[in-house]
Every structure is written in structure tokens, then in C-alpha cells.
């Protein structure tokens, strides 16, 4: 018995079945983050629940040192969401000031390692210019996206600013990957 | 026939096969709101229409005064967009006065609600400032993830402000839930 | 054998098992927009790389002429964003001049079209408007939902103002589809 | 189903001030906006502002401003439109109106007609 | 201000006639367009949100349509209570704004 002859009749190779509760899945959510050191010219990388409350790890997807690892081959739906909280904006200060008004901007980057490869992958970036009017602000950057990825890849969020980040509420900000 | 026999070599354990195309699925898009008693202390549930236009729900999930039922236990990815459009932001008016200027906010939760559980649970928050110096201003929040659910879950959409949804059009507003 | 022998005891009718990785799934992600004519009266529809870097396409699922071909019928994720870049906002010069100040919007929408209907079908909108104080702004606009589309579909990104897209990366600016 | 009941006919002199209200009930009354609006007789209607009954925030026609004052009082559903230096010309029937959001209103009050005579 | 202006201002009609009112903004408004009904000393009732629409509770025969800076309501087959007086309304920004109306008579 093989697999493709479940296949609809235009498709002739067809890849083995398995069972959709067995994939790779995993939703990581918000934790404090401690001041650490972080890598020059890079943005910090997040640190995460994954497995108290909303988080969960499964079917040999796991978590470690940061790091989302990818137990097997294929496509993965990616997302992550980071709310940041600011008490003001240095953009407001400079207008006022009479100079020039370069914003101030959040980001969040899901970033693939790959051991083999010299240089990350940025898979996916939100950029935001925060230039608020108000003393304080708050706003979540979401993000989703398919890729292909291999076994043995590393997923990390990385974030413009680590002290900004909103860590109250694991609602707020998360980040979670799955094989389709 | 067991449905190992379908699994990679390295996967001992393995869940019954399922079609995918008989997998519990939700979209539902906005419809107007009427003024309606709401819970005291809990922003307002947003209704949605299950049928007509790009609307649809299949295979056991229903809908039904609010919430979407969850007919089987398992993994999903749930999403939603919520577009808020205000006449004028407060906080300008505030600012305008010489006042100490607390933001606006625009606030979007998906909720779970669990019959054997007193207290729903947050599963996604958006929430964001709105200090506009416009006099008028839209804006969406969007969210998605994936979450474990049981059978007989509740989800619904929660709202700050219920009065500034933009219920005009199917794709501005929408609620969607699917079994991975 | 049929597939429904894999099913759970309480559902009856059952569609033909298929493997995940024979779906047909895209990425797609930003390329420079060379001036074109666009449609009067429509947003412009934006073109994309879908072969280099990130971005593929995968079993039968074809793109040509600035669409998503959709190979065959069932329920689909359909997700893009745009990120937007300005170098000034009007509203913030029309209020300087003590004149209404009307905002500025992005928009971003994700379109069917399908060739036995006259009218193109907006499954997704994302819209905000833009009254930005700083002289520079940049926001991503981020949609994602569950269509049901039958083969023969196509999809499309249409943006408010084409000249306003980030195109410089790849991660900032995409757009993708896979069958569930 | 919501309703929205208004005080009663008031006949005030020119230069004075008049306080209608606006008992709301059947929903919750801090989560929708409440507007106001006039109607001259034989006239068409004419948007005087609105406000945001959870934070008391308003919003004023620039008509109106500096002579309309809305306010709220939460512990009894009520909405209060207040405006001063009458003249003659704003004799006129007042509604409060509110509805699920901008786009239209479902209820409406009674309305209150406002005469302005010396 | 956004101005609203309708037209006609009054019209004369039968009972089963089709009756068309314009609406026409000074600026486009998208399809932030409400419709209402008066009757003499009655508030207003609402009939059409988006443009296009059906408040709840209202009857097929009246339609809306247009986006833009151009709308119209439709009255498909005139009853005896549909002779009243009607009014559109812009909900793009504020001020909101009301067309002059336009009166319904019996013929």
C-alpha cells in the first residue's frame, strides 16, 4: 500500500502520510528578561516560556538557550508577536528641541541559524518609526510566515530595543512555529 | 492497518491518519453591532456572521451567540483582525488643555472560555496607544497563533471599545479558527 | 481501503487522505516596482520575486504576472506584508497650514480574482492612516486569514500607493498561500 | 432592545442656558458614544457632538463650541447636553441618539423641544 | 466640513412606484454613508450603514448603493408607509454631516 494512492489522480509522486497530531509544534511565550551580555552589532535575541501556562513544546520540537531547534525537514509556519511599552519618545524631545526628527523605531527579526552557514537569515522583519506625540506609548509587531526549513535549524526572535519589550503578559508577546 | 506504518522511520508512536479537508474550520466576519448589555468589568464580545459572504464554518465547528464552539481536541491556529476607526483622539484634546496626556488605547483579546474553568483565559492580546493629532484615524490590529484546545472550548473576540470597530466591510474585521 | 477508516468513530463521511508535503504552498517575497500601467480606479497590484533567496513555490502552485495561480480546490492561509515607507506625511503639512487635516492612509488588500466573475473579490484588507509628526515614517501592514478557493483562483496584493513599499528586503515585504 | 428617554419641553429667554438629559437603558451604557442632534422646525438635522460616556471625553461641531456642554453621569445612565447664550434660533426639537458605532444610530430619544423666546 | 447635499428635495409618488434618492458628498467618503427615515414628530429611524447595507429589521425594498463622492437609496416598490422624509448622513469624520433631506409625498 502506498501513500499516493490516496492522491488525487493529476498528482503521480506522492510524499508517505503521517499524522497531523505528530508534527513539530511549538508556542513560546514571554518571560523577564535579565540583562545579559549580547552579540556586537546585533540585535538582542529574546528568551522565552516554554512550558508553563500558554507555552508548549512538542513532538521533538524544543527549546534551548533561546532557540526554537527544528527536529525535521520541511515547511513551517513561523509567527511571532512583541509588544513594546515606551515612557517616551526621544523623536518628541528632539522636535521640541527645533532640530531635525529622525524617528525612533522598533523592530523584531525572526532569525534562522543554520550551523553549516556562516551567517544568519533574517526570515522575517517588522519595522515600525515610533514617533508619539504622548508621554508614553505601547504596540505590538506581529509577524507569520512559511519557510522551508532543514533539520538541525535554529529560530530565535530578535528585538531593536530589549528593554522596551512588553514581558507582563503572555498574551502579549510570543513567538511559535509549526510544520504544515 | 496501522497509521505507523505510514510514519518516518524515526517515529515510534503515531496518531490515527484524518483527512485534512474534515478538519474543524471558522471564518467569520464582522456584522454591525447594536447596542447591547455587556458583562460588567469585561470589555464586550464581538458577534459575527457564520454564513453569508466569505463567512463559513464546516466540518463540527459551530457558532453560536458569540462564540466558536470547539468540537474536538487538538492544536489550532487561531487569528483575528480588528479595524478601529475614532473620530478624534482624547489624548489630543487632553494634550490641547496642558494636561498630563494618558494615551488612548485600542485593545483586542481572543479568549477562551472552558465550562469546568471559573475564569476565561487570554490566549492573544493587541493593544496599542492612539494619541493621533488627526482629527480622524483607522488603524488594524492583527493577531494569530497556535493554541492547545479541548472539546467544548469557547473562543470569543474581546474589544476595548466596541463603538469604534469598523464593521463596514468582511475584510477589515474578522475572527477564524482552524485545526492544524 | 478507504480513508475513512482513519477517522474518528463519530464522523462518517471522509475525504481521501494526501500527504502534507505534496500541498501546494507559496512565499513570495518583495522585488523592486518598475512604473506600470495600473487599472484606473483599482489599487496597483504589486509584482514579486518567487523563485530567488526566500521565496518559492511548490506543487503546482504557479505564479505569473503578478498572481497567486491556485492549482487545485480546497481551504487556504493566505497571509502578506507590506511595509511602508514615507519621507513626510501631508496631514502634518495641512495642519501647519491651519487647514482640516483629512489623514493620510496605507492600505494594502488581498484580492481573487476569478475569470467566471466580473468582479474581483477583497478577501483582506489592512488600512491606516498616516499622520505622522516625523519628517520619515516607516509601519508594516500585516493580514493573514482561512479562504476557501476554488482551482483556477487567483491571488493578488494591491497597495494604496505603490511608491511607498519597502522593497529593499526580502523579509519586510511578502506575500504567501498554502492548502491546509 | 435599548432605549434612550429625554427630559421634558423647556421654553427659556434668550441668553440664558438649558440642561436636557438622557436616561439610557437595555444596554451598557458606557460602551457606545452618545450623540447629539438638533432639528430646527421644518428644518433638517444638525450634528452638535458627541461623548464618550467611559471616559467623558468629548467631541464638539466647532459650531457649538464654547456654548455646548455634554457630560455624563455613569451611576444612572444618563447623558446631559447643556448650552448656553440661547438665542432664537436655536429653538429646536434635541435628540441624544447612540448607536453600535459611527456608521448610524439605532436609538434615538424622544427628542426635547427647545424654545427660545423673550 | 464634508457637505452633503440630496436631491431631489421632494418628490411626488405612487404607491408600488421605484423611487431613487441621490445623495452627493463634497469629498469622497468611501462608503461611510447612513440613510435615515422621518416622519413627521417622530426621531429618525435608521435604514442603510455602509452605503449599501440593511439596518436589521428593515424591508429588502429599500437598497443602497455607491462609494466615493455619489450614493443613491432605492425604494423598489413604494408602500403607503414609506412617504415620510429622508436624510443621509456621513460617518467618515467628524463633524459629522446630514444632507438636507429630501421629502417623500404621496402623488
Known amino acids: 500500500l502506498k501513500g499516493q494512492e490516496f492522491a488525487p489522480s493529476h498528482q503521480q509522486v506522492y510524499a508517505p502520510l503521517r499524522a497531523d497530531g505528530d508534527k513539530p509544534r511549538a508556542h513560546l511565550t514571554v518571560v523577564r528578561q535579565t540583562p545579559t551580555q549580547h552579540f556586537k552589532n546585533q540585535f538582542p535575541a529574546l528568551h522565552w516560556e516554554h512550558e508553563l501556562g500558554l507555552a508548549f513544546t512538542k513532538n521533538r520540537m524544543n527549546y534551548t538557550n533561546k532557540f526554537l531547534l527544528i527536529p525535521e525537514s520541511g515547511d513551517y509556519f513561523i509567527y511571532s508577536q512583541v509588544t513594546f511599552r515606551g515612557m517616551t519618545s526621544e523623536c518628541s524631545e528632539i522636535r521640541q528641541a527645533g532640530r531635525p526628527n529622525k524617528p525612533d523605531s522598533i523592530t523584531v527579526v525572526i532569525t534562522k541559524v543554520t550551523d553549516s552557514y556562516p551567517e544568519p537569515t533574517q526570515l522575517l522583519m517588522g519595522t515600525k518609526s515610533v514617533c508619539e506625540v504622548g508621554s508614553n506609548w505601547f504596540q505590538p509587531i506581529y509577524l507569520g510566515a512559511m519557510f522551508s526549513l532543514q533539520e538541525g535549524d535554529k529560530l530565535m526572535v530578535n528585538v531593536s530595543d530589549i528593554s522596551l519589550v512588553d514581558y507582563t503578559k503572555e498574551d502579549k508577546t510570543f513567538f511559535g512555529a509549526f510544520l504544515l | 492497518l496501522k497509521g505507523q506504518e505510514f510514519a518516518p522511520s524515526h517515529q515510534q508512536v503515531y496518531a490515527p491518519l484524518r483527512a485534512d479537508g474534515d478538519k474543524p474550520r471558522a471564518h467569520l466576519t464582522v456584522v454591525r453591532q447594536t447596542p447591547t448589555q455587556h458583562f460588567k468589568n469585561q470589555f464586550p464580545a464581538l458577534h459575527w456572521e457564520h454564513e453569508l459572504g466569505l463567512a463559513f464554518t464546516k466540518n463540527r465547528m459551530n457558532y453560536t451567540n458569540k462564540f466558536l464552539l470547539i468540537p474536538e481536541s487538538g492544536d489550532y491556529f487561531i487569528y483575528s483582525q480588528v479595524t478601529f476607526r475614532g473620530m478624534t483622539s482624547e489624548c489630543s484634546e487632553i494634550r490641547q488643555a496642558g494636561r498630563p496626556n494618558k494615551p488612548d488605547s485600542i485593545t483586542v483579546v481572543i479568549t477562551k472560555v472552558t465550562d469546568s474553568y471559573p475564569e476565561p483565559t487570554q490566549l492573544l492580546m493587541g493593544t496599542k496607544s492612539v494619541c493621533e493629532v488627526g482629527s480622524n484615524w483607522f488603524q488594524p490590529i492583527y493577531l494569530g497563533a497556535m493554541f492547545s484546545l479541548q472539546e467544548g472550548d469557547k473562543l470569543m473576540v474581546n474589544v476595548s471599545d466596541i463603538s469604534l470597530v469598523d464593521y463596514t466591510k468582511e475584510d477589515k474585521t474578522f475572527f477564524g479558527a482552524f485545526l492544524l | 481501503l478507504k480513508g475513512q477508516e482513519f477517522a474518528p468513530s463519530h464522523q462518517q463521511v471522509y475525504a481521501p487522505l494526501r500527504a502534507d508535503g505534496d500541498k501546494p504552498r507559496a512565499h513570495l517575497t518583495v522585488v523592486r516596482q518598475t512604473p506600470t500601467q495600473h487599472f484606473k480606479n483599482q489599487f496597483p497590484a504589486l509584482h514579486w520575486e518567487h523563485e530567488l533567496g526566500l521565496a518559492f513555490t511548490k506543487n503546482r502552485m504557479n505564479y505569473t504576472n503578478k498572481f497567486l495561480l491556485i492549482p487545485e480546490s480546497g481551504d487556504y492561509f493566505i497571509y502578506s506584508q507590506v511595509t511602508f515607507r514615507g519621507m513626510t506625511s501631508e496631514c502634518s503639512e495641512i495642519r501647519q497650514a491651519g487647514r482640516p487635516n483629512k489623514p493620510d492612509s496605507i492600505t494594502v488588500v488581498i484580492t481573487k480574482v476569478t475569470d467566471s466573475y466580473p468582479e474581483p473579490t477583497q478577501l483582506l484588507m489592512g488600512t491606516k492612516s498616516v499622520c505622522e509628526v516625523g519628517s520619515n515614517w516607516f509601519q508594516p501592514i500585516y493580514l493573514g486569514a482561512m479562504f476557501s478557493l476554488q482551482e483556477g483562483d487567483k491571488l493578488m496584493v494591491n497597495v494604496s500607493d505603490i511608491s511607498l513599499v519597502d522593497y529593499t528586503k526580502e523579509d519586510k515585504t511578502f506575500f504567501g498561500a498554502f492548502l491546509l | 432592545q435599548g432605549q434612550l428617554v429625554q427630559s421634558g419641553a423647556e421654553v427659556k429667554k434668550p441668553g440664558a442656558s438649558v440642561k436636557v438629559s438622557c436616561q439610557a437603558s437595555g444596554y451598557t451604557f458606557t460602551a457606545y458614544y452618545m450623540h447629539w442632534v438638533r432639528q430646527a422646525p421644518g428644518q433638517g438635522l444638525e450634528w452638535m457632538g458627541w461623548i464618550n460616556p467611559n471616559s467623558g471625553g468629548t467631541n464638539y461641531a466647532q459650531k457649538f463650541r464654547g456654548r455646548v456642554t455634554m457630560t455624563r453621569d455613569t451611576s444612572i445612565s444618563t447623558a446631559y447636553m447643556e448650552l448656553s447664550r440661547l438665542r432664537s434660533d436655536d429653538t429646536a426639537v434635541y435628540y441624544c441618539?447612540?448607536?453600535?458605532?459611527?456608521?448610524?444610530?439605532?436609538?434615538w430619544g424622544q427628542g426635547t423641544l427647545v424654545t427660545v423666546s423673550s | 466640513d464634508i457637505q452633503m447635499t440630496q436631491s431631489p428635495s421632494s418628490l411626488s409618488a405612487s404607491v408600488g412606484d421605484r423611487v431613487t434618492i441621490t445623495c452627493r458628498a463634497s469629498?469622497?467618503?468611501?462608503?461611510?454613508l447612513n440613510w435615515y427615515q422621518q416622519k413627521p414628530g417622530k426621531a429618525p429611524k435608521f435604514l442603510i450603514y455602509?452605503?449599501?447595507r440593511l439596518q436589521s429589521g428593515v424591508p429588502s425594498r429599500f437598497s443602497g448603493s455607491g462609494s466615493g463622492t455619489d450614493f443613491t437609496l432605492t425604494i423598489s416598490s413604494l408602500q403607503p408607509e414609506d412617504f415620510a422624509t429622508y436624510y443621509c448622513q456621513q460617518s467618515d469624520s467628524t463633524p459629522i454631516t446630514f444632507g438636507q433631506g429630501t421629502r417623500l409625498e404621496i402623488k
Open positions: 455602509a452605503a449599501s
Open positions: 441618539a447612540t448607536g453600535g458605532s459611527w456608521e448610524g444610530f439605532d436609538y
Open positions: 469629498q469622497s467618503i468611501s462608503s461611510y
